[in-house]
């Protein structure tokens, strides 16, 4: 039950996180005009990964896409790449994790397969979250660097007076969305990995085997030996992964694979 809950919660948290990463990637407000020097500006600038926008005094907002690919800063390209990789990995992770969910039965999928899929999706979510956090952090670092550079430039020129004040940019809403979303995806991935450990059946349960001692008709039913008992053939002491019927003894040994939440 706890495993199913952990897996389900991990999936939901990751789903929210990936939706947030997609939202952050599409948002225009990665950087917004710093209003410290001009709080009464009638023209407000903000920029995203794909376009820059200007809101004018009329209330009209004009956005223009970055139609060049080669002319863009390498850092911006890197951020775009990180965010896209994060989204792709997250989307694949979501797809894999849907089939890995314990509460969903698909044919006669073995628990080991579900465990492997859960682990795979968990790792994908972790990498996806890290990509998003890295992308947002690289962009934030770029902003901080540019902010202080433009601050230094602001007070240079003829007698310390400049007529054209350089527009400075600060953190936009998308950065915070990205950080939170990346964190959620990361947490979701960790939860999936934890759930994977609980999903993998432990090597403690075997099908009941009858051993016939020579000359006697005494049946031994060793229920749950981990190591060979030293008598009889050990080749039959195999852990079962099939979803088939179980003996009475085995039913007592560990919870059913088909627990539903």
């Amino acid at each position: 039950m706890a495993v199913t809950a952990c897996q389900g919660l991990g999936f939901v948290v990751s789903l929210i996180g990936i939706a947030g990463i997609i939202a952050a990637t599409c948002m225009d407000q990665w950087s917004t005009q710093d209003l410290y020097n001009n709080p009464v500006t009638a023209v407000f600038n903000y920029q995203g990964l794909w376009r820059s926008c200007v809101r004018e005094s009329s209330g009209f907002t004009e956005c223009r896409g970055y139609f060049t690919l080669l002319g863009l800063p390498a850092m911006l390209q890197a951020v775009r790449a990180l965010m896209i990789v994060g989204i792709v990995l997250g989307a694949i992770g979501l797809l894999v994790s849907i089939f890995a969910l314990k509460c969903i039965r698909i044919g006669s999928m073995e628990d080991s397969a579900k465990a492997n899929m859960t682990l795979t999706s968990g790792i994908m979510f972790i990498v996806s979250g890290l990509c998003a956090i890295a992308g947002v952090s690289v962009f934030a670092n770029m902003l901080v660097t540019n902010f202080w550079m433009s601050t230094a430039n602001m007070y240079t020129g003829m007698g310390g007076m400049v007529q054209t004040v350089q527009t400075r940019y600060t953190f936009g809403a998308a950065l915070f969305v990205g950080w939170v979303a990346g964190g959620l995806t990361l947490i979701g991935g960790v939860m999936m990995c934890i759930a994977c450990r609980g999903l993998a059946p432990e090597e403690t349960n075997y099908k009941a085997v009858s051993y016939h001692a020579s000359g006697h008709s005494v049946a031994y039913k060793p229920g749950g030996f981990k190591a060979s008992t030293g008598f009889g053939s050990n080749t039959k002491n195999k852990k079962i992964y099939d979803g088939g019927a179980r003996t009475e003894d085995e039913v007592q040994s560990y919870p059913s694979k088909h627990d539903y939440v």
Epitope: T41, V43, N45, S52, E56, S57, S58, G59, T164, V165
Partner: antibody
């Protein structure tokens, strides 16, 4: 076509208040901010403030702060500008202005403040 | 507040003349975000509301004759009428559309010589 129709001329006593209306048509009212500008006789145009019809957010010229209130009735596509504590120097033609680049102006409302 | 200074305050010209009027702002009206200068020119005739002529310092509003042209950047701007027509005799205002409060120049009155 885009049109702004303002209310008629007003004559007020000093200390009184005036409320000028501006009915918009020919465009989506909430798409653009509504600005108010006045022009006193022989004076340059003077910006009073604006309202964002989407959220009711306003920004006023410090000169008029505390005396001016701009409101909107989005259902009627109408903006209002109320100026209180009127004085003789408030005698002017008041205009509402909207659309991109502040291209569309109302016909103007003459407010005369006289004792 | 940004102070807008227009010169001359009045101009006496004949029909067909080329006219240039200037507008200076106390601060730059250039927006680096979209590389535009937020200066607007209006024409006003007596008893009428101002009419938009030029926005972004040099972009003509639709329907405005091409004899009107705007130029300049930063703090210095000009409005030129290549060949004055009888209907052009009016007062011309420049406006700061970059920073609140939005401010207007004192105007240049174009009169018939």
């Amino acid at each position: 076509q885009v049109q702004l129709v303002q209310s008629g001329a007003e004559v007020k006593k000093p200390g009184a208040s005036v409320k000028v209306s501006c009915k918009a048509s020919g465009y989506t009212f909430t798409d653009y901010n509504m600005h108010w500008v006045r022009q006193a006789p022989g004076q340059r145009l003077e910006w009073i403030g604006y309202i964002n019809p989407n959220n009711g957010g306003t920004s006023y010229n410090q000169k008029f702060k505390g005396r001016v209130t701009i409101t909107v009735d989005t259902s009627a596509s109408t903006a209002y500008m109320e100026l209180s504590s009127l004085r003789s120097e408030d005698t002017a033609v008041y205009y509402c202005v909207t659309t991109r680049y502040l291209a569309v102006w109302g016909q103007g409302t003459t407010v005369t403040v006289s004792s | 507040d940004i102070v807008m200074t227009q010169s001359p305050s009045s101009l006496s010209v004949s029909v067909g003349d080329r006219v240039t009027m200037t507008c200076k702002s106390s601060q730059s009206l250039f927006n680096s975000g979209n590389q535009k200068n937020y200066l607007t020119w209006y024409q006003q005739k007596p008893g009428k509301a101002p009419k938009l002529l030029i926005y972004w310092a040099s972009t003509r509003e639709s329907g405005v004759p091409d004899r009107f042209s705007g130029s300049g950047s930063g703090t210095d701007f000009t409005l030129t009428i290549s060949s004055v027509q009888p209907e052009d005799f009016a007062t011309y205002f420049c406006q700061n559309d970059y920073s609140y409060p939005l401010t207007f120049g004192g105007g240049t009155k174009l009169e018939i010589k």
